[in-house]
Interface confidence: low
Amino acid sequence: DSEEDEEHTIITDTELPPLKLMHSFCAFKADDGPCKAIMKRFFFNIFTRQCEEFIYGGCEGNQNRFESLEECKKMCTRDNANRIIKTTLQQEKPDFCFLEEDPGICRGYITRYFYNNQTKQCERFKYGGCLGNMNNFETLEECKNICEDGPNGFQVDNYGTQLNAVNNSLTPQSTKVPSLFEFHGPSWCLTPADRGLCRANENRFYYNSVIGKCRPFKYSGCGGNENNFTSKQECLRACKKGFIQRISKGGLIKTKRKRKKQRVKIAYEEIFVKNM
């Protein structure tokens, strides 16, 4: 059928990997607080997945606020190189393979894989779409490669680690992790799926910006929002190409100070999720 054909249309943009944060406060919105000072601070932006500048009012706010770009990166972005090197050299499972499955605080219900230390195999679980822990893989193969034992009791493949000829160090090679991203598509592509208020059950697609994919959902027939497409391809056309890699890896995206005062002491769950 035509939708089957559409399925194989080439979308060249890199898919976003799962969002895995070190601390839950990294998912909070930038909160300038109720005071009127103009102080340059940094916060971790869950949409662009990087630390960015914002203007802090000087009081209250939340924990997603750092004095320097370096401090923000240290707290909210993962550098797993040391752990990867250690596990590769010692042929051990990474520590996170032994963590319990963690759905996180959001409500996307994405099928993911985790290593179950009881059964010694990778299994599916429901991931909410944000936070959680690193025992969380997009594909079964990735989970098996990292956490399951190979036939000889060793890991099958530890992140594709290879020797870097420049500094003779081990470097993790990953095709999945993008560099810096900006979203230039329609703003509604960043909103959650919204069933609306009626009682129908229509098959629709919405763009899940956490995982960078279009997923099906049930639309009630009225209301809702614009992140609502009748086909997967229409969804991809509208939203997928919005994620583009930044040309320059330097510089910061500035967040304008809000004119109208809004209390935004809310976690990612409220940003991204609507009770339906």
Epitope: D1, E7, Y109, T111, K126, G128, R195
Partner: antibody, heavy 122, light 111 residues
Framework: EVQLQQSGTVLARPGASVKMSCKAS????????IHWVKQRPGQGLEWIGA????????TYSQKFKDKAKLTAVTSASTAFMELNSLTNDDSAVYYC???????????????WGQGTTLTVSS | DIVLTQSPASLAVSLGQRATISCRAS??????????MHWYQQKPGQPPKLLIY???KLESGVPARFSGSGSETDFTLNIHPVEEEDAATYFC?????????FGGGTKLEIK
């Protein structure tokens, strides 16, 4: 109209292997997972495993991981389940079903095949 | 594995009366307000048919006399008023994680 059409009744000898099919139509085959469920006569339903036809990722119940092998051929919109080393305990009706993922509502089986009856007998 | 225990195993209900079927999970199947418990109806010689998903949501085309409720570990399927065509076996099923599991089934007879 969404349909899952399963292959017909199979009679097999103990120790043999069988492969049954589930042909999907009326929707994009690669978008939805296909699950397999076993039902022995007069008994309940047992989940065997599931396959994502889009990339052939398969996941199995611990109980069936050495018994069943799930595959899919996207060009034919067909999922397959192969059962090996058959015993009398494998005699059952086997259903394929489509898993629907609807965001906030979780996921579940919205369409089922009519079932393939397997009888293992010497 | 999550074990789903259905009760009763069978029940006979008079036409027009209420049928109540219970399903208890060995651990919670709810995450952040979504209840990953679903109900199916199966008639002899037929595959199961989805009735209720996410504990309480009625599948399209299913009569409104079917309703579901519950959260965490305790779920209920209600049929009211019961009709002749409702004679069948009813199964609950959870999808919070692999392996997906089903309840043992409840056979409903109409008196």
């Amino acid at each position: 109209e969404v349909q899952l059409q399963q292959s017909g009744t199979v009679l097999a000898r103990p120790g043999a292997s069988v492969k049954m099919s589930c042909k999907a139509s009326g929707y994009s085959f690669t978008t939805y997972w296909i699950h397999w469920v076993k039902q022995r006569p007069g008994q309940g339903l047992e989940w065997i495993g599931a396959i994502d036809p889009g990339n052939s990722d398969a996941t199995y119940s611990q109980k069936f991981k050495d018994k069943a092998k799930l595959t899919a051929v996207t060009s034919a919109s067909t999922a397959f389940m192969e059962l090996n080393s058959l015993t009398n305990d494998d005699s059952a009706v086997y259903y394929c079903s489509r898993e629907v993922y609807y965001g906030y509502d979780g996921d579940y089986f919205d369409y089922w095949g009519q079932g393939t009856t397997l009888t293992v007998s010497s | 594995d999550i074990v789903l225990t259905q009760s009763p195993a069978s029940l006979a209900v008079s036409l027009g009366q209420r049928a109540t079927i219970s399903c208890r999970a060995s651990e919670s199947v709810s995450v952040h307000g979504t209840h990953l418990m679903h109900w199916y109806q199966q008639k002899p010689g037929q595959p199961p048919k989805l009735l209720i998903y996410a504990a309480s949501k009625l599948e399209s085309g299913v009569p409104a006399r079917f309703s579901g409720s519950g959260s965490e570990t305790d779920f209920t399927l209600n049929i009211h008023p019961v009709e002749e065509e409702d004679a069948a076996t009813y199964f609950c099923q959870q999808s919070i994680g692999d392996p997906w599991t089903f309840g043992g089934g409840t056979k409903l007879e109409i008196k």
